[in-house]
């Protein structure tokens, strides 16, 4: 299946936290393909974060297409990690919280966080940059939200929502005051360029969020951060499309770009390392 990206205008009422995907194809736009059949299929909508129905033309398209709602949910919703509605007060941790920290077979000296089941706390470790396991988080907060117990012994999920101990209702943890423009692309687009720890001089690009442009820098060959792209196009694709203009009532409208379909690399990347 080809990997194609089609821009849509998206309006949503609530602001959601950064999206974590089980599979990168879950972020592909629904693609009906060039054929004219009318086939009911399901796709994962990264904006509503739900599996939804769409009409598939019967040929081509992409991997974000499933025969059933159940198959879509199984592949694209992180049920084990993101149970927003839980049936019990003592919410269970995802299985991967109990995996030992695993630096992986590469050696890139990247700071990550894992849940230590012995100490019952999230701790820092050095991740190598490839493979490993899912007990691997970019931030301490994210690790705590998913794997640590909350103050009252219940789980806080990573949508910034926690189960109210009194009436089992969902309570948002925070609401942001909207500004005219906000950045809703990958969080690493806002980080400064980081040469890393090695001695190479590789030509790379990083997104400069102050001027809103991709700029070249010299990468050392290891370490650094994720604001690091091999081409200017790759950088723009991942970061430039993240600016979203706010409209009334705090809704979001994503600026529509009219262009022909073209092969692009997906801009939404997994924060978790894929499972073994």
């Amino acid at each position: 299946d080809s990997e194609e990206d089609e821009e849509h205008t998206i309006i949503t009422d609530t602001e959601l936290p950064p999206l974590k995907l089980m599979h990168s194809f879950c972020a592909f736009k629904a693609d009906d393909g060039p054929c004219k059949a009318i086939m009911k299929r399901f796709f994962f909508n990264i904006f509503t974060r739900q599996c939804e129905e769409f009409i598939y033309g019967g040929c081509e398209g992409n991997q974000n297409r499933f025969e059933s709602l159940e198959e879509c949910k199984k592949m694209c919703t992180r049920d084990n990690a993101n149970r927003i509605i839980k049936t019990t007060l003592q919410q269970e941790k995802p299985d991967f919280c109990f995996l030992e920290e695993d630096p992986g077979i590469c050696r890139g000296y990247i700071t990550r966080y894992f849940y230590n089941n012995q100490t019952k706390q999230c701790e820092r470790f050095k991740y190598g940059g490839c493979l490993g396991n899912m007990n691997n988080f970019e931030t301490l907060e994210e690790c705590k939200n998913i794997c640590e117990d909350g103050p009252n012994g219940f789980q806080v999920d990573n949508y910034g929502t926690q189960l109210n101990a009194v009436n089992n209702s969902l309570t948002p943890q925070s609401t942001k005051v909207p500004s005219l423009f906000e950045f809703h692309g990958p969080s690493w687009c806002l980080t400064p360029a980081d040469r890393g720890l090695c001695r190479a001089n590789e030509n790379r690009f990083y997104y400069n969020s102050v001027i809103g442009k991709c700029r070249p820098f010299k990468y050392s060959g290891c370490g650094g951060n994720e604001n690091n792209f091999t081409s200017k196009q790759e950088c723009l694709r991942a970061c430039k499309k993240g600016f979203i203009q706010r409209i009334s009532k705090g809704g979001l409208i994503k600026t529509k770009r009219k262009r022909k379909k073209q092969r692009v690399k997906i801009a939404y990347e997994e924060i978790f390392v894929k499972n073994m």
Partner: antibody
């Protein structure tokens, strides 16, 4: 110059255990800038990764799901080698088995390979 | 598992001419830290595989500059600018984006 020297029997009976050893020279099995793997090659399956071990703060391993219930890869630090054990073999396990070093520092890849051992599973 | 699909499976070449091998992954090889999690290997007749290209586009030590790797997402290419007789063998792509590590089925390059 890293060299990997494989040894072990070329013929194994069905239901028995396949055992191969890979002796390392020019590097250490405990090196924190390498990982050590077994890969097999057969006409039907092509190159198939079986598993890997590596030492960082402690020993880690990962195995292919297809063989996970039957495979063990162990380091032997005293002899600077690592071994493959594959239990309950069937004719499907007939292949050329390679040990390989994964370079963990700059060159992320299998940069050194053993000479290969053809293992035939037959009674 | 990520499935790696190579094309063509057989590539007859003329010495001095360019050659190109394609490798497609069943899902995007996630691009983190500026790295493409894809390698290329060459297995010459009767030998073990050898690393040619690592991290998508970097030549391994001792590999001639006529070899180059490119691509991102799901589509990758190995190019030989001018094929030499010693380049014959089977070329494999390999991903290390997620376990299990998987290889393409191989492209056999032979002299016409």
């Amino acid at each position: 110059q890293v060299q990997l020297q494989q040894s072990g029997p070329g013929l194994v009976k069905p239901s028995q255990t396949l055992s191969l050893t890979c002796a390392i020279s020019g590097d250490s099995v405990s090196s924190n800038s390498a990982a050590w793997s077994w890969i097999r090659q057969s006409p039907g399956r092509g190159l198939e990764w079986l598993g890997i071990i590596y030492k960082r703060s402690k020993w880690y391993n990962s195995y292919a799901v297809s063989v996970k219930s039957r495979i063990t890869i162990n380091p032997d630090t005293s002899k600077n080698q690592f071994s493959l054990q594959l239990n309950s073999v069937t004719p499907e396990d007939t292949a050329v088995y390679y040990c390989a070093r994964w370079h963990s520092d700059k060159m992320w890849g299998f940069d050194d390979w053993g000479q290969g051992t053809l293992v035939t599973v037959s009674s | 598992d990520i499935v790696m699909t190579q094309s063509p499976l057989s590539l007859p070449v003329t010495p001095g001419e360019p050659a190109s091998i394609s490798c497609r992954s069943s899902q995007s090889l996630v691009f983190r830290f500026g790295i493409t999690y894809l390698n290329w290997y060459l297995q010459k007749p009767g030998q073990s595989p050898q690393l040619l290209i690592y991290k998508g586009s970097n030549r391994a030590s001792g590999v001639p500059d006529r070899f180059s790797g490119s691509g991102s997402g799901t589509d990758f290419t190995l190019k030989i600018s001018r094929v030499e007789a010693e380049d014959v063998g089977v070329y494999y792509c390999q991903q290390y984006d997620s376990y299990p590590l998987t290889f393409g089925q191989g492209t056999k390059v032979e002299i016409k």
